[in-house]
Interface confidence: medium
């Protein structure tokens, strides 16, 4: 599964949209979790409403908000007031019982100060592909990676 690398500015909001097959994932809740390591579990940050028909309602945990458009097949996660500590590897997941199917892997990077490094334009160069592999972002730049990681729990 490809990993999309998204960059946001500290203090701003970062919005991630993970797309999925609406029919295949009919009735399933969605979750946003943080993968701590190769062997470790994915630590749940926030999940959509417990009643699937109400999944369009925003659910918040701290500064992270999730909402699911089940008809369009798009789950949207917003990281508000982005901080350096929010940087990390995350997953959009579709939940079925105790099983979690990974919809998208997202590596979040936080740019602390737009004026901090005048070579930032050289450092964060987008990959050749401009495709977001099913994840889109606002208020950020992004570079798409071809990373394939081993399965995680």
């Amino acid at each position: 599964l490809n990993t999309t690398v998204l960059q946001g500015m500290a203090g701003q909001s970062l919005r991630v949209s993970c797309t999925y097959d609406a029919l295949k994932h009919w009735g399933r809740r969605k979750a946003w979790c943080r993968q701590l390591g190769e062997e470790g579990p994915c630590q749940r940050v926030v999940s959509t409403h417990g009643v699937w028909l109400l999944a369009f309602l925003k659910k918040r945990n701290g500064s992270t908000v999730i909402a699911d458009d089940t008809l369009a097949g798009t789950v949207t996660i917003t990281l508000k007031n982005l901080q350096a500590g929010d940087a990390g590897l995350y997953q959009c997941q579709s939940l079925r019982g105790r099983e979690a199917e990974v919809l998208q892997k997202v590596l979040v990077e936080v740019l602390e100060d737009p004026l901090d490094d005048q070579d930032a334009g050289d450092l964060w160069v987008p990959e050749e592909s401009s495709s977001f592999e099913g994840a889109q972002v606002e208020h950020s730049t992004s570079r798409n990676q071809e990373t394939s990681f081993p399965p995680t729990s």
Partner: antibody
Framework: EVQLLESGGGLVQPGGSLRLSCAAS????????MAWVRQAPGKGLEWVSS????????YYADSVKGRFTISRDNSKNTLYLQMNSLRAEDTAVYYC????????????WGQGTLVTVSS | DIQMTQSPSSLSASVGDRVTITCKAS??????LAWYQQKPGKAPKLLIY???NRFTGVPSRFSGSGSGTDFTLTISSLQPEDFATYYC?????????FGQGTKLEIK
């Protein structure tokens, strides 16, 4: 077992060039970001450069930007560091390291190769 | 760039002692911190990632804690093989900055 074996170090004059190699085995090389980290004699660790698993994006410390080039050949399971315009302050042991998922933490390291820049 | 400062720079202790090494970030880094151990003439080894997660094969006497700007590495009962230099490192945001190191010596 993960193994990283660096080579190519040696003595070079200021302004000269050197290419380091790192042969990787024991894991699917093409799935992982890789990096170079150096350590000057008696000093601490300094990250030098990283690149993505595809090699499509590269990252450099300010101290080497424009002089060093990181690259990889996934078909040969090998990581490279081309070092040009070498300075005395580049003298260090250079370690090749496997980086987990673009995180910047290095879970496996090579034994290092010494680069000495001196006239 | 965020700076990482370790204290103390060096530390003398005895086998069986409980030892704590601290690392301070110049800005909030959440839990994005790793710890490494390095013995003379050897490559560093990853001990702890994401503040408190022990890497594969790391003994349970090593533990990490903290959040934000202040972090600690604790060795609950020093063993002879633990005498080494320890480095903290800020992760997940380039440049990957290391602390200056803490040398743990035998008293």
């Amino acid at each position: 077992e993960v193994q990283l074996l660096e080579s190519g170090g040696g003595l070079v004059q200021p302004g000269g060039s050197l290419r380091l190699s790192c042969a990787a085995s024991g894991f699917t090389f093409s799935n992982y970001y890789m990096a170079w980290v150096r350590q000057a004699p008696g000093k601490g660790l300094e990250w030098v450069s990283s690149l993505t698993n595809s090699g499509g994006s590269t990252y450099y410390a300010d101290s080497v930007k424009g002089r060093f080039t990181i690259s990889r050949d996934n078909s040969k399971n090998t990581l490279y560091l081309q070092m040009n315009s070498l300075r005395a302050e580049d003298t260090a042991v250079y370690y090749c390291a496997k980086e987990w998922a673009g995180s910047g933490y290095f879970d496996y390291w090579g034994q290092g190769t010494l680069v000495t820049v001196s006239s | 760039d965020i700076q990482m400062t370790q204290s103390p720079s060096s530390l003398s202790a005895s086998v069986g002692d409980r030892v704590t090494i601290t690392c301070k970030a110049s800005q909030n880094v959440g839990n994005n911190l790793a710890w490494y151990q390095q013995k003379p003439g050897k490559a560093p080894k990853l001990l702890i990632y994401y503040t408190s997660n022990r890497f594969t094969g790391v003994p349970s006497r090593f533990s990490g804690s903290g959040s934000g700007t202040d972090f600690t590495l604790t060795i609950s009962s020093l063993q002879p093989e633990d005498f080494a230099t320890y480095y903290c490192q800020r992760i997940y945001n380039s440049p990957w900055t290391f602390g200056q190191g803490t040398k743990l010596e035998i008293k």
